[in-house]
């Protein structure tokens, strides 16, 4: 369901989108993800902030925690203990990096309707979670891990060496949080809560990035973050497991690192519990084309963890890096030794494989010139996964069920024909044993969330259909959207074109390219959005195009790994190629073409502007990378190798924006960055600006004081207003 476009009879009542609509979030949508607590029950926070328990079988709902209780501690989040005796209430949320934050936690006792007094939790806490069974608590405070057997008990301190910016226990350091896990936590309960595994990150030898935070004090603060840039010293990681029933008995036991990994710099990439006494760890060489999955067992006699070489599974890429963006995680079957995993097949497409003994003997479960994206759930008789197989559109996601209980296994698309026009991009959330599941459809029509029976796939009810949004859009002239492909030199370039509401092919329109283009990304997706570029098409009459070129994901390894060790070349070439093809279509004013991007997209847009093609009149780079030597080791080296003479230093040097400073002379360039960007440091734009000044090239710039990579809050409004003015001026559009 795409809201109705323009009906001539109603044309006078229809209006274009305004920038204000976008900045106010007038046309934002809601999704509904149940917080599953059993096979047939879930919790959801109601509009009036009560925490409500829904029982699907009986159709009944119950308020288990009132908004009054939530409000009494200004709680913004909650977590029910698995034994349903207690709820933690989270308040004083204070954001740190992308996922991490600190908060104050209160424990509410449901049996007597009172907050637990005595042995209260310290504040602020960096991470807190319940055990999977009962109501044990694990939490991280000041980089150390603590355990409580019951919420009112005194805590047991598990680690003692935690130190700010030096040793992190149970939480990741900056680079592991952003580029490897990527989570705010680094501790994992075993399925029944017998053991607690955790990572320790030692950042003592990592160089520190320091930047000023101006605040409103007389002297700015300096923010210091251990941040390994390409080629720098990396964190040293160790994994420990402790028995939570008798934590003081033998204390934390270290899990051994596979010998072939430990021989040089390495990363830990993920931990998956299989049973209470079997755990699976994934490791990765610093040169990220070799990954090892290691299955370890608890030795009762020695109270240690044994990881036999026979239970080591190696995944290696000969054409690129291991995995997609990350190395995929295993999903274990009920025998607790075999597992399902997504990795490249012999034809270079990511597919589901079943590994019983060795990777070499893996049984391929899915196959074709498309990719399996995510394994949601494996039950005794079914495997649920998502892919972009249907109708050969890589930017779609449908949910499939493979029956693994019967032979040969049969495959069914659960979502392909549900709401075909409205919904072509799904994710799913499953209850215990996949008894029920929620489908969340992101578009291309207005998003809708529905509840389904896990056995029959029958829709039970609509959880959220965004009726208010649908009504609000009834009198809006939304742009038209097309997703098509270009075939160029044996490369398929998928693109999304956003066209003004009264688009006429015989007229000429200004073109704006929006680019991200980072490795394993995808911009051309069949999703709903009413955003800044929707406004530019609807109100300002621009054509906007997004193009997925080489290096992008879900179309096979040939396209994905094309950029390996040479970032900044083909991504840019493919944007330029697409622009030339768009000009050939006849409706683009070739004197009014612009490009813009954020982060990796800012890097690509900068390089495109400095390509010397004369195609672009102007462009914008928001928070761009300018040299890969300035970015994080884990991300950069995955795609570029090391910046050393005997590895890939030459391309590190050749692929900088600064090296092309002279080429900006004939374009209008707007450079934008937040001064407190912890991710792509302000250093990147500072160096571009310096190179442009040294080359005596005129450009425009805007910095956002104390803003990070997201440029949020009031900065967002200022940013989009500023960029709008810049583009309208570039395209000679009146204000």
């Amino acid at each position: 369901l795409r809201p109705s476009r323009v009906h001539n009879s109603e044309e006078n009542t229809m209006r274009a989108l305004t920038l204000k609509d976008i900045l106010n979030g007038t046309f934002s949508y809601k999704t509904f993800f149940p917080n599953w607590i059993s096979g047939q029950e879930y919790l959801h926070q109601s509009a009036d902030n009560n925490i409500v328990l829904y029982n699907i079988e009986t159709g009944q709902s119950y308020t288990i925690l009132s908004n009054r209780t939530m409000k009494s501690v200004n709680a913004s989040n909650y977590g029910l203990s698995p034994d349903r005796q207690f709820v933690y209430l989270e308040s004083d949320y204070s954001k740190l990096w992308r996922y991490s934050y600190t908060a104050t936690y209160y424990i509410y006792d449901l049996s007597n309707g009172e907050f637990v007094r005595g042995n209260e939790l310290p504040r602020p806490i960096q991470y807190l979670c319940w055990s999977p069974v009962g109501s044990k608590l694990a939490y991280v405070y000041q980089n150390n891990i603590y355990l409580k057997q019951r919420p009112g008990d005194p805590p047991f301190q598990i680690t003692f060496n935690g130190r700010e910016n030096k040793i992190f226990n149970g939480i990741p350091d900056w680079v592991y949080e952003e580029e490897m896990l990527p989570t705010k936590y680094a501790l994992w309960w075993s399925p029944n809560g017998k053991f607690l595994a955790y990572a320790e990150f030692n950042d003592k030898d990592i160089p520190v990035i320091a930047y000023s935070y101006y605040g409103d004090e007389q002297y700015p603060r300096t923010i210091n973050i251990p941040y390994p840039k390409a080629g720098a010293k990396n964190p040293v990681v160790r994994i420990f497991i402790i028995d939570t029933t008798y934590p003081a008995y033998v204390g934390p036991q270290e899990v051994p690192v596979p010998a072939m990994i430990a021989s040089s710099d390495y990363y830990f990439s993920w931990l998956t519990w299989v049973t209470d006494e079997r755990v699976c760890l994934q490791w990765l060489k610093r040169v990220q084309n070799v990954s090892v999955l290691s299955i370890c067992d608890f030795r009762e006699d020695w109270q240690t963890w044994d990881c036999p070489k026979t239970q080591e599974h190696i995944e290696e890429s000969r054409t690129g890096w291991a995995g997609g963006f990350f190395v995929s995680r295993p999903v274990f079957s009920y025998d607790a030794i075999s597992y399902y995993k997504i990795f490249s097949d012999k034809d270079g497409y990511k597919h589901i494989h079943y590994i019983k003994d060795t990777v070499e003997n893996a049984i391929q479960i899915t196959s074709g010139k498309w990719e399996a994206i995510n394994i949601f759930r494996v039950t005794q008789d079914s495997l649920f996964y998502s892919s972009n197989e249907f109708e050969e559109y890589p930017g779609r996601r449908n949910i499939y069920r493979i029956s693994i209980g019967s032979y040969p296994p049969s495959k069914k698309c659960v979502t392909c024909h549900l709401r075909k026009e409205r919904c072509q991009y799904y994710t799913a959330s499953f209850s215990d044993y996949a008894k029920y599941y929620a489908l969340v459809c992101y578009g291309p029509g207005i998003p809708i969330s529905t509840l389904h029976d896990g056995r029959t796939d029958q829709e039970i009810k609509i959880l959220e259909e965004n009726k208010e949004l649908e009504n609000a859009l009834k009198n809006i002239q939304l742009p038209k959207e097309e997703i098509k492909k270009l075939e160029v030199d044996e490369i398929t370039l998928w693109y999304k074109m956003i066209l003004p509401p009264q688009f006429d092919r015989s007229k000429k329109y200004p073109l704006l390219i929006q680019v991200y283009g980072g490795p394993c990304s995808q911009s051309v997706r069949s999703v709903f959005a009413v955003n800044w570029i929707s406004y530019l098409a609807s109100k300002e009459g621009m054509v906007i195009a997004l193009v997925d070129g080489r290096g992008t994901a879900f179309q096979g390894d040939k396209l994905l790994y094309a950029v390996y060790r040479k970032l900044g070349v083909y991504e840019v070439e493919d944007q330029i190629t697409a622009v030339r093809k768009f000009i050939e279509m006849g409706f683009i004013d070739e004197k009014r073409i612009a490009i813009w991007g954020w982060s990796y997209g800012g890097y690509v847009s900068s390089l495109a502007l400095a390509s010397g093609t004369g195609l672009f009149k102007c462009g914008i780079a928001v928070a761009p990378v300018s040299s890969w030597e300035y970015y994080a080791s884990v991300y950069t080296e995955r795609f570029m190798g090391l910046p050393t003479k005997d590895d890939n230093l030459e391309h590190y040097k050749n692929s900088t924006v600064m090296a092309r400073a002279e080429y900006f002379r004939n374009v209008d360039y707007l450079l934008i960055h937040g001064t407190a960007d912890d991710n792509v440091h302000f250093q990147n734009s500072a160096q571009i600006a310096k190179a442009l000044v040294n080359a005596q090239v005129d450009f425009q710039a805007m910095w956002y004081s104390d803003q990070n990579h997201g440029l949020s809050g009031l900065s967002t409004n200022h940013l989009y207003t500023h960029m709008t003015h810049f583009l309208k001026q570039c395209f000679s559009l009146s204000d």
Epitope: L53, E57, Q60, Y62, D83, R84, L110, S111, N112
Partner: nanobody
């Protein structure tokens, strides 16, 4: 172990008054969460109200404001009271008990059950 026996059911007029009782045997009654379930013809058994050992109450949204659950630990009895029954409240009402939290709505999570008492609300 705890044995449960319901009473107080029967025919009642809409907007009349109804009080169900559930007597429990056993000395540790006070440590159990107690619940009232009901099952209408052709429907699954559903939790109507529950009360924790600490006295916190919990109601299905469909009966909230109309039904009241209470317990008397001295008498080893739990009650379900309503002053505004509706025809759709017609069902067999079962008393149930469990150790631990009252916040479970699936019958499988409640190990101890009474025999049930029929309640018919006439319009």
């Amino acid at each position: 172990q705890v044995q449960l026996q319901e009473s107080g059911g029967g025919l009642v007029e809409a907007e009349g008054s109804l009080r169900l009782s559930c007597a429990a045997s056993g000395r540790t009654f006070g440590s159990y969460a107690m619940g009232w379930f009901r099952q209408a013809p052709g429907k699954s058994r559903e939790l109507v109200a529950a009360i924790s050992s600490g006295g916190t109450t919990y109601y299905a949204d469909s009966v909230k404001g109309r039904f009241t659950i209470s317990r008397d630990n001295a008498r080893n009895t739990v009650y379900l009271q309503t002053n505004s029954p509706k025809p759709e409240d017609t069902a067999v009402y079962y008393c149930a008990a469990r150790t631990g939290s009252a916040y479970y709505t699936n019958r499988i999570d409640w190990p101890y059950w009474g025999q049930g008492t029929q309640v018919t609300v006439s319009s």
